[in-house]
């Protein structure tokens, strides 16, 4: 059976294509083509005279047909016009025709797309932004890249027009992109330059830093404000709630006990209208802001119940700082055989009984700052029962 | 069944005009080149002019050139010959005929019954 | 004068072989195909063979055809009395750039 096969059947415009003739019989005058899907004379391509091997234009040539003796039939430099069916009719020497049609698809070479956005500075959870990857074509694919991967499932991102319009809903911080969108037909593909997102957000609560809340006297008091927002946020401070100043930092040099207050940082996006503050309390003392992990010590760690005592010592290089004792988590003392001396620096235990036995620690601590020690473990013996003498009683 | 059927024939005076037509049927007209062929009386076949399929494609008889015009309407399956200036030389029976071949190798496998046309004063 | 020669007659007796010549040159008979036609009185002409040597349908195969250079040749075999008639040769003409037919020939089919 006669056919015919284009190849390529996909073709891009400009290039040529070549539609070949599969089975033709033997024993013929001649053969035309013609464009659609039947033989219409108006549309004739051309024909060809096996006789003469003569070609001969139809109605319908371009003059970029070439016909071979094969009977195939080049067309060169296609345009999107020449899209659709081509019919080739054999005119055989028995006088019965036959009939082929096959068809093509000429495809634009697609141009570097580029991205239109409805609103490039979206306010964070309020504003929506739609991109319409441009131009409009016909037959053509639409893709789309977030940070150079494809699109994620969300509920925020939505696909329309073809594919040719992204929304994305309630835009958030991280929806800053970089976004490309990307053309495809079958014959060709093209991605945009990157475009970003200026989300605008924030102030969110702002963060004061350093984390320190004791000061010596003496020290400078040097805080930093942070918070993050797009445009970059205004700052302010209050101490005790006085204005101070407009500037991210606040520098307060050789700071006296009178600096102790509460220090309020206040951050403001001009473009969002919204405002966040921080409050930090500032301690200014002499005492130690760090407190040093004491140790403990035992007069002996394994004693005999009921017979004898024992006394822990807890020691620290600090000043100004107390001490208190803790037993299995209880504080102590707990008991009237339990005593404290040299300002509580000293546990003493007198007598021991077994439910003595067990996990000790001591813990330092100031108005600013504590510690605690290893924790050290007490080990109650009871001697045998003395044997009875078999003696009765006087 | 194919059928080829003139009409338009008649007497007409010399340097006069006459209208031929041809109807087909039977078989997809818009497929094949036409033709038109002569017969003087008493005299052989001459050819008078073809018409591709698609109507691209016209020939004429030096003997005609310039005077007979013809045309086709694929949409009503007819053939025409559109005859000016008339010639007593141009009397005869007016024949249509059908070339399968699209030309590719000339031959008139059915013809009208022919339609005789008379130019005399 | 026809572009195309053939004998203005031919004749045979029934059951007989005859052949009739048609006489051309290179832009016609040379290089392309060549057709006959029967006319019986007072009827259209019939396509008996085309290019050169084929028959269509129908016709019998009583009737040959051959071409050699720029001759062609029309032979009819087992000749009967229904195939008096005239018959004309025919070929496109690449010089004139038309169809080109032969005087005719009358043939008589005797006894």
């Known amino acids: 059976q006669l056919t015919t096969e284009s190849m390529p059947f996909n073709v891009a415009e400009g290039k040529e294509v070549l539609l070949l003739v599969h089975n033709l019989p033997q024993q013929l005058f001649g053969y035309s083509w013609y464009k659609g899907e039947r033989v219409d004379g108006n549309r004739q391509i051309v024909g060809y005279a096996i006789g003469t091997q003569q070609a001969t234009p139809g109605p319908a040539n371009s003059g970029r047909e070439t016909i071979y003796p094969n009977a195939s039939l080049l067309i060169q430099n296609v345009t999107q016009n020449d899209t659709g069916f081509y019919t080739l009719q054999v005119i055989k020497s028995d006088l019965v025709n036959e009939e082929a049609t096959g068809q093509f698809h000429v495809y634009p070479e697609l141009p570097k797309p580029s991205i239109s956005s409805n609103n490039s500075n979206p306010v964070e959870d309020k504003d929506a932004v739609a991109f319409t990857c441009e131009p409009e074509t016909q037959d053509t694919t639409y893709l789309w890249w977030i940070n150079n991967q494809s699109l994620p499932v969300s509920p925020r991102l939505q696909l329309s027009n073809g594919n040719r319009t992204l929304t994305l809903l309630s835009v958030t911080r991280n929806d800053t992109g970089p976004y490309e969108c990307e053309i495809q037909n079958p014959v060709s593909a093209n991605r945009s330059d990157p475009v970003t997102l200026n989300v605008t957000y924030g102030p969110d609560t702002p963060t004061i830093s350093p984390s320190d809340t004791y000061y010596r006297p003496g020290a400078n008091l040097s805080l930093s404000c942070y918070a993050a927002s797009n445009p970059p946020a205004q700052y302010s401070w209050l101490i005790n709630g006085t204005f101070q100043q407009s500037t991210q930092e606040l520098f307060i040099p050789n700071i006296t006990v009178n600096n102790s207050g509460s220090y309020t940082c206040h951050a403001n996006n001009s473009v969002t209208g919204c405002n966040r503050t921080t409050v930090k309390t500032i301690i200014v003392t002499e005492l130690s802001p760090v407190v040093a992990k004491p140790q403990i010590k035992a007069s002996k760690t394994t004693v005999t119940g009921d017979k004898d005592s024992v006394n822990l010592t807890c020691s620290t290089n600090d000043t100004g700082i107390s001490i208190r004792w803790f037993f299995k988590n209880q504080s102590l003392p707990s008991s009237e055989r339990m005593k404290l001396s040299q300002g509580n620096t000293t546990l003493s235990i007198n007598p021991v009984k077994r439910e003595d036995a067990g996990t000790y620690w001591c813990e330092v601590f100031n108005p600013i700052s504590k510690n605690q020690s290893d924790p050290i473990m007490l080990n109650v013996n009871y001697n045998a029962l003395p044997q009875e003498n078999g003696l009765s009683p006087g | 069944e194919v059928q080829l059927l003139e009409s338009g024939g008649g007497l007409v005076q010399p340097g006069g005009s006459l209208r031929l037509s041809c109807a087909a049927s039977g078989f997809t007209f818009s497929n094949y080149a036409m033709s038109w062929v002569r017969q003087a009386p008493g005299k052989g076949l001459e050819w008078v002019s073809v018409?591709?399929?698609?109507?691209?494609?016209?020939y004429y008889a030096d003997s005609v050139k310039g005077r007979l015009t013809i045309s086709r309407d694929n949409s009503k399956n007819t053939l025409y010959l559109q005859m000016n200036s008339l010639r007593a030389e141009d009397t005869a029976v007016y024949y249509c005929a059908r070339d399968p071949t699209k030309g590719y190798a000339p031959t008139f496998d059915y013809w009208g019954q022919g339609t005789l046309v008379t130019v005399s004063s | 004068q026809s572009v195309l020669t053939q004998p203005p007659s031919a004749s045979g007796t029934p059951g007989q072989r005859v052949t009739i010549s048609c006489s051309g040159s290179s832009s016609n008979i040379g290089n392309n195909y060549v057709s006959w036609y029967q006319q019986l009185p007072g009827t259209a002409p019939k396509l008996l063979i085309y290019?050169?040597?084929r028959r269509p349908s129908g016709v019998p195969d009583r009737f040959s055809g051959s071409k050699s250079g720029t001759s062609a040749s029309l032979a009819i075999s087992g000749l009967r009395s229904e195939d008096e008639a005239d018959y004309y040769c025919?070929?496109?003409?690449?010089?004139?750039?038309?169809?080109?037919f032969g005087g005719g020939t009358k043939l008589t089919v005797l006894g």
């Open positions: 025919g070929a496109w003409d690449a010089s004139y750039n038309g169809y080109v």
């Open positions: 290019a050169d040597s």
């Open positions: 018409i591709s399929h698609g109507g691209g494609s016209i």
